[in-house]
């Protein structure tokens, strides 16, 4: 940055190089150039010469004043007009930053996604600070009192192998930047209570033309957790409101869920699960689309039909790549 230049003098900022956004600030420039009594001192912000609010303090020093400075970053430098010099002479430069102290981190959440081998902790950092803000995640065993700290700039993944102080911990987050420091409340966790089962995935759907047509959704998870509660939500793509069905699930085999749906309508399905009685849900699965056939199904694609046991016809949808869920962060 501009701070690496060779200086023939000194530039400084009051109250500080990093300051609260919206403050009034003063930038001082003091020349120390051999054989030069500056006729004039000039200030530049991001390469553009400033015209106003410049005060000459003495023969070698001038001040530039800004009211209500709102730019997150700016490069400042100052120059001198020296007698017998055709060009301005560079005195010095400085990068300045404005921003806010951190808010108190809240909504601290830690979960273990099954098979990940990590505990993932996230939090709400609050308003944008505009300046470099670091977070220290503290994890303290309620059994051994041992504490581990992890420095990060956003969320953190902590290897569960490193959590050797038993099952019960306190977790809290400390936020710090040049303008201040804040700390969250302490979250008490038990490692067995924060496991989120392996993702549930909808693999295919078929509509069977029985007396009353029904749609079967096939879905599965690789979870080894025995007691799992799931929700499947579905709606016509033209609707705003979701319908939700709840299931107590045993994933020793592929799940089949039956729905009686309107004909000739495109539906979207999502599923999510949690360990029964625990706090955290999976994010909703990827969107799965399925269009129900007309009342008397029209055979439109060989790929999506085959004979079924009730002599009806089947219209099927198969999961390939799906759009990502609009609620992937919904774990509360």
């Amino acid at each position: 940055g501009i701070t690496n230049i060779n200086c023939s003098g000194h530039i400084w900022v009051e109250p500080a190089t990093i300051f609260k956004m919206g403050m009034n600030i003063s930038i001082y420039c003091q020349a120390a150039i051999k054989n030069c009594q500056p006729r004039k001192l000039h200030f530049y912000k991001n390469g553009i010469k400033e015209r106003f609010q410049i005060t000459r303090i003495n023969k070698t020093t001038a001040r530039l004043w800004y009211k209500n400075f709102l730019e997150p970053h700016a490069s400042m430098y100052c120059t001198a007009e020296c007698p017998k010099h055709f060009q301005e002479t560079l005195i010095c430069g400085k990068d300045i930053s404005s921003g806010y102290p951190p808010d108190i981190p809240d909504e601290v959440t830690c979960v273990i996604y099954e098979y990940s081998g990590n505990m993932t902790c996230t939090w709400n950092a609050g308003k944008l600070t505009y300046i470099d803000t670091k977070y220290v995640v503290h994890v303290k065993s309620l059994e051994t009192e041992e504490e581990q700290q992890y420095l990060t700039s956003s969320y953190i993944n902590i290897s569960t192998d490193s959590l050797q102080g038993g099952k019960k911990y306190l977790v809290w987050v400390q936020a710090a930047n040049a303008l201040g420091m804040e700390e969250s409340k302490q979250l008490q966790i038990h490692l067995d209570d924060i496991v989120i089962p392996s993702a549930a995935v909808i693999s295919r759907a078929e509509t069977i033309n029985a007396t009353v047509p029904k749609t079967i959704i096939y879905w599965d998870s690789q979870t080894t957790i025995e007691k799992v509660s799931c929700e499947m939500r579905y709606k016509a793509t033209t609707n705003q409101t979701w319908n939700v069905k709840e299931f107590d699930t045993n994933f020793t085999y592929v799940q089949q869920s039956e729905f009686y749906l309107e004909p000739n309508i495109k539906y979207v399905f999502q599923v999510r699960c949690q360990e029964t009685g625990k706090r955290y849900w999976q994010p909703w699965s990827s969107l799965f689309f399925h269009k129900t056939p007309e009342t008397v199904p029209q055979v439109t694609s060989k790929a999506f039909q085959h004979d079924t046991w009730n002599s009806g016809l089947t219209v099927a949808s198969i999961s390939t790549g799906h759009l990502t869920s609009d609620n992937r962060g919904d774990i509360g």
Epitope: V136, H138, K140, L142, T144, E145, E146, E147, Q148, Q149, Y150, L151, L170, W172, Q174, M181, E182, E183, Q186, Q188
Partner: antibody
Framework: QVQLQESGPGLVKPSETLSLTCTVS?????????MCWIRQPPGKGLEWIGC?????????YYANWAKGRVTISVDTSKNQFSLKLSSVTAADTAVYYC????????????WGQGTLVTVSS | DIQMTQSPSSLSASVGDRVTITCQAS??????LAWYQQKPGKAPKLLIY???KLAAGVPSRFSGSGSGTDFTLTISSLQPEDFATYYC??????????????FGQGTKVEIK
């Protein structure tokens, strides 16, 4: 045998900076640990000054009465910890202790014997 | 700011007496509390940590109890070497920007 040894001048002039070093031997420090400084003014109770956490990063914590005046630092290669307290007054006259458990707990199994620092002109 | 309030500030007791000292935290500190014994001219000595765990080499007449905000140190049968000053210390967290002191004010146990 665990030993914590505080060292530094016993007399400091008002407005100057008090500087103490704690040299630790006999402790196999864990990967994460706390080292703390505590003081005790004559005839009074224990006063926490601050701690340094040493792990994958270094973090310092100070009592709010000492903020802006105190700096705690570590030289891990020498197992030495230092305390600097600036702008001292007569109220900073005390026995200064360093203390640790050699791990990342905040109770102290091991203490130095303490060193008396007098602030006087 | 977590504040530690210890009581009484002093007490007189005889050898063989059961002595109880209490410590109250201004907020929940779980079981993160330690007790120390200090004799004149000496550094403090750890007696109890995690509210109720006896430190190595400490006689079993010393015991600690409590969690959350209220804690107790009990000496079941006071011995001549137990006359000293006792301090509680919260060991929950020091990262809070507003901590003034982590120790209680101390309780001096004197001979009656």
């Amino acid at each position: 045998q665990v030993q914590l040894q505080e060292s530094g001048p016993g007399l400091v002039k008002p407005s100057e900076t008090l500087s103490l070093t704690c040299t630790v031997s006999g402790i196999d420090f864990n990967s994460n640990y706390y080292m703390c400084w505590i003081r005790q003014p004559p005839g009074k109770g224990l006063e926490w000054i601050g701690c340094i956490y040493v792990g994958s990063h270094v973090n310092t914590y100070y009592a709010n009465w000492a903020k802006g005046r105190v700096t705690i630092s570590v030289d891990t290669s020498k197992n030495q910890f230092s305390l600097k307290l600036s702008s001292v007054t007569a109220a900073d006259t005390a026995v200064y202790y360093c203390a640790t458990s050699g791990s990342s707990v905040l109770y102290f199994k091991f203490w130095g014997q303490g060193t008396l620092v007098t602030v006087s002109s | 700011d977590i504040q530690m309030t210890q009581s009484p500030s002093s007490l007189s007791a005889s050898v063989g007496d059961r002595v109880t000292i209490t410590c109250q935290a201004s907020e929940n500190i779980y079981s993160f509390l330690a007790w120390y014994q200090q004799k004149p001219g000496k550094a403090p000595k750890l007696l109890i940590y995690s509210a109720s765990k006896l430190a190595a080499g400490v006689p079993s007449r010393f015991s600690g109890s409590g969690s959350g905000t209220d804690f107790t140190l009990t000496i079941s049968s006071l011995q001549p070497e137990d006359f000293a000053t006792y301090y509680c210390q919260q060991t929950n967290r020091y990262s809070n920007p507003d901590i003034y002191n982590v120790f209680g004010q101390g309780t001096k146990v004197e001979i009656k």
